[in-house]
């Protein structure tokens, strides 16, 4: 017996052909002897089978000896045994019809699980492959399950559903919501205004939520909100601001806030979360603000960072062309009794610039 | 002899209405699915919309909720209803029979008549 | 969606050549496509269906043949009446598409 797997929700074509090529009376039935359609001359007609609307055949074929069975909009029920009868033989055809669905909806935040559900139809004992979007394989029985999604999970998942040898492809788009990047820091020397850019990791027609950011300064004892606000099909609109720092925020995605000036007391990390409608669990992105100062004071050159700095961070003072004259890692360095011209204070990760401040000291008469 | 005759065709302005009809002979009109099948001035055949013997019917992305395909059985006659026409549908638009249903192909078809749509 | 890529978009040939137009379909279309003629004016007469089954009154240097996603229109000898336009249609499901066509011309 032949046997042929067919999709939930997709076409299956069965096919039948008879020895003579040319159109001869045949008749499809199913295991009860239902009929479902047949011929009558050149004109299709259906038996009272629960196929009716749904089956259908090609009638171009027929002068060929072909006379193939459509059925259309699979559902798991559809698993049967089809019989074709045509020229006195009878030609029998397993169709094995399975479901592949998401339990949830395709839409997951990052961290949560994914679990995928196979239907399939009593007797049958098929085997699940799935593959991620990253290539990572999982197999399964009934249900696969994935827990903490990443973003590289975001894509087509693409399951084989393998039973009597033969097997069908389902093709599943998991989408999993997060921000671009779990961290950013920014470098900025004192009075520069301030950018904080938070891209999403995905696209979607609508998007309703509010979200929020909190801001541990490095100076203060405790995190404080620093703007609340909401998100309407991708519009953005500030429900509530600090008076310091008065907070700018743009009114398209990305979600963009502007600090109108970097200062001492606002360096720090912050949280963005992100609450969407009709998803349990948040959105994060963590923004770290590091703010440098040079001063000159008397005789004493003095270049300070504040904020979330590595421990492997640079900090130097140099005379702008030579050698540097201070290079420690701290979070500041002094020149006692500075020669007069262009100095550089240079935050650096192993060679490379992040920070930059230049100050020019006058000669002393 | 199978024969299909299509009218109603004309110049209409964006944004309006018109119904196509075809009528059709010397088959049995009932046993086949029928399409519509459109050509704008220097292009190619374009599928607009079908309908088969039990009266489903199957559109095209281009047209689907502004055009309408159905089928009169008693009077041998197939119909487009289209609105919310824009320049873009200006064409001649063909009926045709299929071989049989809707898995068939278009094996017959009229001379068609056309759709013009400007202000 | 299937598309239909058809080719070459036209074609000059002479009296008595054998010509090949081809149609790629972007999936499988399991051997279900026609093909059609249609002279200036005039609707589309089929000539061929289900890949190489000629339509009744069709001549028999037309010839078809393919699987999968490539097929071919062959004319063995070209004939004055077959400078026309010519298309593919896929009817492997109902959402039917057709090849941009291909004009042959006199050379």
């Known amino acids: 017996k032949k046997v042929v797997l067919g999709k939930k929700g997709d076409t299956v074509e069965l096919t039948c052909t008879a020895s003579q090529k040319k159109s001869i009376q045949f008749h499809w039935k199913n295991s009860n002897q239902i009929k479902i359609l047949g011929n009558q001359g050149s004109f299709l007609t259906k038996g009272p089978s629960k196929l009716n609307d749904r089956a259908d055949s090609r009638r171009s074929l027929w002068d060929q000896g072909n006379f193939p069975l459509i059925i259309k909009n699979l559902k798991i029920e559809d698993s049967d045994t089809y019989i074709c009868e045509v020229e006195d033989q009878k030609e029998e055809v397993q169709l094995l019809v399975f479901g592949l669905t998401a339990n949830s909806d395709t839409h997951l935040l990052q961290g949560q699980s994914l679990t995928l559900t196979l239907e399939s139809p009593p007797g049958s004992s098929p085997s699940v492959q799935c593959r991620s979007p990253r290539g990572k394989n999982i197999q399964g029985g009934k249900t696969l399950s994935v827990s903490q999604l990443e973003l590289q999970d975001s894509g087509t998942w693409t399951c084989t559903v393998l039973q009597n040898q033969k097997k069908v492809e389902f093709k599943i788009d998991i989408v999993v919501l997060a921000f671009q990047k779990a961290s950013s820091i920014v470098y900025k020397k004192e009075g520069e205004q301030v950018e904080f850019s938070f891209p999403l990791a995905f696209t979607v027609e609508k998007l309703t939520g509010s979200g929020e950011l909190w801001w541990q300064a490095e100076r203060a004892s405790s995190s404080k909100s620093w703007i609340t606000f909401d998100l309407k099909n991708k519009e953005v609109s500030v429900k509530r601001v600090t008076q310091d720092p008065k907070l700018q925020m743009g009114k398209k995605l990305p979600l963009h806030l502007t600090l109108p000036q970097a200062l001492p007391q606002y360096a720090g990390s912050g949280n963005l979360t992100l609450a969407l409608e009709a998803k349990t669990g948040k959105l994060h992105q963590e923004v770290n603000l590091v703010v440098m100062r040079a001063t000159q004071l008397q005789k004493n050159l003095t270049c300070e960072v504040w904020g979330p700095t590595s421990p492997k961070l640079m900090l130097s003072l140099k005379l702008e062309n030579k050698e540097a004259k201070v290079s420690k890692r701290e979070k500041a360095v002094w020149v006692l009794n500075p020669e007069a011209g262009m100095w550089q204070c240079l935050l650096s990760d192993s060679g490379q610039v992040l920070l930059e401040s230049n100050i020019k000291v006058l000669p002393t008469w | 002899e199978v024969q299909l005759l299509e009218s109603g065709g004309g110049l209409v302005q964006p944004g309006g209405s018109l119904r196509l009809s075809c009528a059709a002979s010397?088959?049995?009109?009932?046993?086949?699915?029928m399409s519509w099948v459109r050509q704008a001035p220097g292009k190619g055949l374009e599928w607009v919309a079908s309908?088969?013997?039990?009266?489903?019917?199957f559109y095209a992305d281009s047209v689907k909720s502004r055009f309408t395909i159905s089928r009169d059985n008693s009077k041998n006659t197939l119909y487009l209803e289209m609105n919310s026409l824009r320049a873009e549908d200006t064409a001649v638009f063909y009926c045709?029979?299929?071989?049989?249903?809707?898995?068939?192909?278009?094996?017959?078809w009229g001379q068609g008549t056309t759709v013009t749509v400007s202000s | 969606d299937i598309q239909m890529t058809q080719s070459p978009s036209s074609l000059s040939a002479s009296v008595g050549d054998r010509v090949t137009i081809t149609c790629r379909a972007s999936?499988?279309?399991?051997?279900?496509i026609a093909w059609y003629q249609q002279k200036p004016g005039k609707g589309p007469k089929l000539l061929i269906h289900?890949?190489?089954t000629l339509h009744p009154g069709v001549p028999s240097r037309f010839s078809g043949s393919g699987s999968g996603t490539d097929y071919t229109l062959t004319i063995s000898s070209l004939q004055p009446e077959d400078f026309a336009t010519y298309y593919c249609?896929?009817?492997?499901?109902?959402?039917?598409?057709f090849g941009q066509g291909t004009k042959l011309e006199i050379k």
């Open positions: 249609l896929q009817y492997d499901n109902p959402l039917y598409t």
């Open positions: 289900y890949t190489s």
């Open positions: 010397g088959f049995s009109f009932s046993n086949y699915a």
């Open positions: 309908i088969n013997e039990g009266g489903s019917t």
């Open positions: 999936q499988d279309i399991n051997k279900y």
């Open positions: 045709s029979r299929h071989y049989g249903g809707s898995y068939d192909p278009m094996d017959y």
